[in-house]
Interface confidence: low
């Protein structure tokens, strides 16, 4: 690629490149990876400015500005299944190279919660306008695209390449051209900082003459955190120009000798480095006295210094080291505060979720809301929790108290509910009578009926129509309270007795209905069943005082 055909900005310890291309986020990340980088991070306002600069370069390379919005992928993504966290600046997104808790963000608009698909972030640019330094591109989140379908308005992407350090650009003391080739395969002749391991090709001369010389240099680490080209003195010097061409390539002062030669010098408070071109501050910070991420600020005239901490940190008692500020001491959150390095985040207690005005507010989760109730029957939402309830005839059950279990009224603690036979049903019960007896209108007592040799009356199955000796004999009428929603009985007898419908016949039924032949254990011998004198009936012979029960599931209900 020819020099300056690519958009590249280097600053601090990283370089940023911007590229056109209608690609998915994954394809863009792959291209950055191929050259040893990632999709760009924007972890601070300073970094946002570098990214804006490289995008401005890219836009300048396009012949005309177009009247449309364009999006450029950066390396901020949220995996499928990970939900939005409104309390964090990054809202639960994280940088592809690592890092979730960076404090800077610049969202285009409030994010909508969606956990079901991977989401990616792009920078939103108005391509009809030149980029203004004060208006940093906003972050827009959306689907990550797929090969051949990058997503709406995706125009390109920004890569970031990190380095141990940077060399200063080579300064020429006479006519010539410098071309830098970076480790990420970009060539440029106008870098403000040149990354470690870059090569510099210096072609001296006017360009149209054959007297041009070429020099090659490599940006190396000369000492820990000290990077330079290993060149000595200004390059491409010419007696014809002396100090007049580019200040002789000198960083600060240029001193001419009488013979057309010249030397570089430095102003008070600075010293000339080994390259005989660059000046460095003769400052008290050169020994790096500040620790723990603190920045050393030299005092005036090269005397004294102060250490400054990044936001969210403060100097310790030594005034040299940075320690994390515990923002949680200020109680900035409604419920739970988690201190993090340089910041904090708010969390909500179990039974609450983020919400309500302001930062760190929590609101009650309505566990009983439609479709999310954990209760089998009734559910009541409470502040921070909930509780379950059961309809009449059921009791709470299960380890967590969310299930409802049928109460067997036939063996209830209040003693027999029926005067003779008792049938437990789901949520209720029915009464029945021994042969020769019929159920009284109160649905509980038995009265002497027509002489019959049939079995006890009052079967579990109300739908049954049985035939015996040519006649249809419907089951005994038994009834139980009907129930409304949330466990509210529509009609509940005060004595918990089954209700009898007015048109129900009182009769006996075939034995086969109650106990099909060969079905063991359903009934004890009829002789043990009894009626009481409540209806003026007499107790049959062999009167045992127990009450027989049968559950609807066909098991013996007597416990």
């Amino acid at each position: 690629t020819g020099a300056d055909t690519e958009a590249v900005v280097c600053a601090g310890t990283a370089c940023y490149t911007a590229h056109w291309g209608k690609l998915s986020a994954a394809e863009a990340q792959n291209l950055c990876l191929q050259n040893g980088g990632n999709l760009a991070t924007v972890k601070s306002e300073e970094e946002a400015q570098h990214v804006q600069q490289v995008l401005a370069q890219l836009l300048r390379r396009e012949a005309a500005l177009t009247a449309r919005m364009g999006k450029f992928w950066i390396g901020l993504q949220r995996e499928k299944g990970k939900c939005l966290d409104p309390s964090l600046p990054l809202k639960g997104f994280s940088w592809v190279g690592g890092g979730e808790d960076t404090p800077y963000s610049n969202w285009h608009k409030e994010l909508r919660n969606s956990c079901i698909s991977k989401r990616c972030v792009s920078l939103l640019l108005d391509l009809s306008q030149p980029l203004l330094p004060g208006r940093l591109p906003k972050w827009s989140e959306g689907p990550c695209g797929s090969p051949g379908s990058p997503g709406s308005n995706i125009e390109g992407f920004v890569c970031k390449f990190s380095f141990k350090g940077m060399c200063r650009p080579l300064a020429l003391g006479g006519p010539g051209q410098v071309t830098y080739t970076t480790p990420f395969q970009t060539t440029s002749s106008s870098l403000e900082a040149v990354p470690f391991a870059s090569a510099a090709n210096v072609a001296c001369g006017e360009g149209d003459k054959d007297d041009s010389q070429s020099h090659y240099f490599l940006c190396k680490e000369k000492a820990p955190d000290v990077f330079d080209w290993g060149s000595s003195g200004p390059l491409c010097v010419s007696p014809k120009y002396g100090c007049n061409f580019n200040n002789g390539g000198c960083h600060q002062d240029c001193f001419e000798g009488g013979d057309g030669s010249f030397l570089c010098g430095c102003r008070p408070g600075f010293r000339l480095l080994d390259d005989l071109v660059t000046c460095a501050s003769r400052n008290p910070c050169s020994s790096s006295p500040c620790r723990g991420g603190a920045t050393c600020i030299p005092g005036p005239h090269g005397k004294n210094y102060t250490c400054r901490c990044p936001q969210g940190y403060q100097l310790d008692s030594s005034q040299l080291d940075c320690v994390d500020v515990d923002e949680c001491q200020d109680s900035p959150c409604a419920q739970e505060c988690v201190n993090t390095p340089g910041s904090f985040r708010c969390e909500c207690w179990v039974g609450y979720e983020p919400g309500g005005p302001g930062e760190g507010a929590c609101q009650d989760v309505d566990e009983c809301a439609l479709g999310r109730s954990p209760c089998a029957q009734g559910c009541t939402n409470t502040e921070g929790s909930f509780h379950c309830s059961c309809e009449e005839g059921y009791v709470l059950a299960g380890e967590d108290g969310t299930q409802c279990q049928d109460v067997d009224e036939c063996v209830g603690p209040g003693g027999p509910l029926c005067d003779s036979l008792c049938f437990n049903t789901q949520g209720s019960f029915r009464c029945g009578c021994l042969p020769g007896w019929v159920l009284a209108p109160n649905g509980v007592s038995c009265a002497m009926g027509p002489v019959s040799l049939g079995p006890p009356s009052g079967p579990p199955d109300e739908e049954y129509k049985g035939e015996r000796e040519g006649s249809t004999v419907p089951p005994a009428a038994t009834a139980s309270p009907t129930r409304g929603p949330e466990g509210t009985p529509k009609s509940t007898p005060t004595t918990r007795r089954p209700l009898l419908s007015s048109d129900a016949p009182i009769t006996s039924v075939p034995l086969e209905v109650l106990a099909p032949s060969g079905s063991p254990g359903l009934w004890r011998e009829p002789s043990i069943h009894h009626t009481t004198a409540a209806s003026g009936a007499q107790e049959p012979a062999g009167g045992d005082s127990s009450v027989a029960t049968q559950n609807d599931d066909g098991t013996d209900g007597q416990k």
Epitope: H108, Q311, G358, E383
Partner: antibody, heavy 116, light 107 residues
């Protein structure tokens, strides 16, 4: 220590404009929501506007919507309230507040007087 | 908008007395209610957050209670520095609103 210092108040004509500033120090400004709250001469407190920690969300009292703009400069640790089309009901002491659980910290206030 | 009604408007007490200030919301605000004190010629300061949660550096004689629509600020054994205005504020929904205040004055 948390410190909030308001400035920019003064006497302004009906329909005029004014920009209030609030210099914040002693805490990580970019971590917190910030608000403006005003107090009328009758001592009634009224919330005016809130801005989220990164500046991407703003909320306004209905009566100031479209006339007031809340903004922040995290590099300068400064909160702003640009007021225009001022009416007599806007006369009040304007407080800059840091929002956490309620209005956790308040400045000393700056008086805005709207005259006919 | 949620309206907060404070009562009484004025309360005359002597140091050593204990008092209860009431704040009633026009609709349920759960526990999203905060209390502020404003002494003469000073800015308001947060006393109680979320109806009953104490704030560091605020004397323990100040306490809050209530949930839903009815809230109370209690001051146990009033001291001279406690005289001034007391405001309640809700953060349940936008717009954030304040009560008109209760003035606590020396009898």
């Amino acid at each position: 220590d948390v410190n909030l210092v308001e400035s920019g108040g003064g006497l302004v004509k009906l329909g005029g404009s004014l920009k209030l500033s609030c210099a914040a120090s002693g805490f990580t400004f970019s971590n917190y929501y910030m608000s403006w709250v005003r107090q009328s001469p009758e001592k009634r407190l009224e919330w005016v506007a809130t801005i989220s920690n990164n500046g991407d969300s703003t909320y306004y009292l209905d009566t100031v919507k479209g006339r007031f703009t809340i903004s922040r400069d995290s590099a300068e640790n400064t909160l702003y309230l640009q007021m225009s089309s001022l009416i007599s009901e806007d006369t009040a002491v304007y407080y800059c507040t840091r929002v956490g659980t309620g209005f956790t910290y308040w400045g000393q206030g700056t008086l805005v007087t709207v005259s006919a | 908008d949620i309206v907060l009604t404070q009562s009484p408007a004025t309360l005359s007490v002597t140091p050593g007395d204990s008092v209860s200030l009431s704040c009633r919301a026009s609709q349920s605000i759960n526990n999203y209610l905060h209390w502020y004190q404003q002494r003469s010629h000073e800015s308001p300061r947060l006393l109680i957050k979320f109806a009953s949660q104490s704030i560091s550096d605020i004397p323990s004689r100040f306490s809050g209670s209530g949930s839903g629509t009815d809230f109370t600020l209690s001051i146990n054994s009033i001291e001279t520095e406690d005289f001034g205005m007391y405001f309640c504020q809700q953060s349940n929904s936008w717009p954030l609103t304040f009560g008109a205040g209760t003035k606590l004055e020396l009898k």
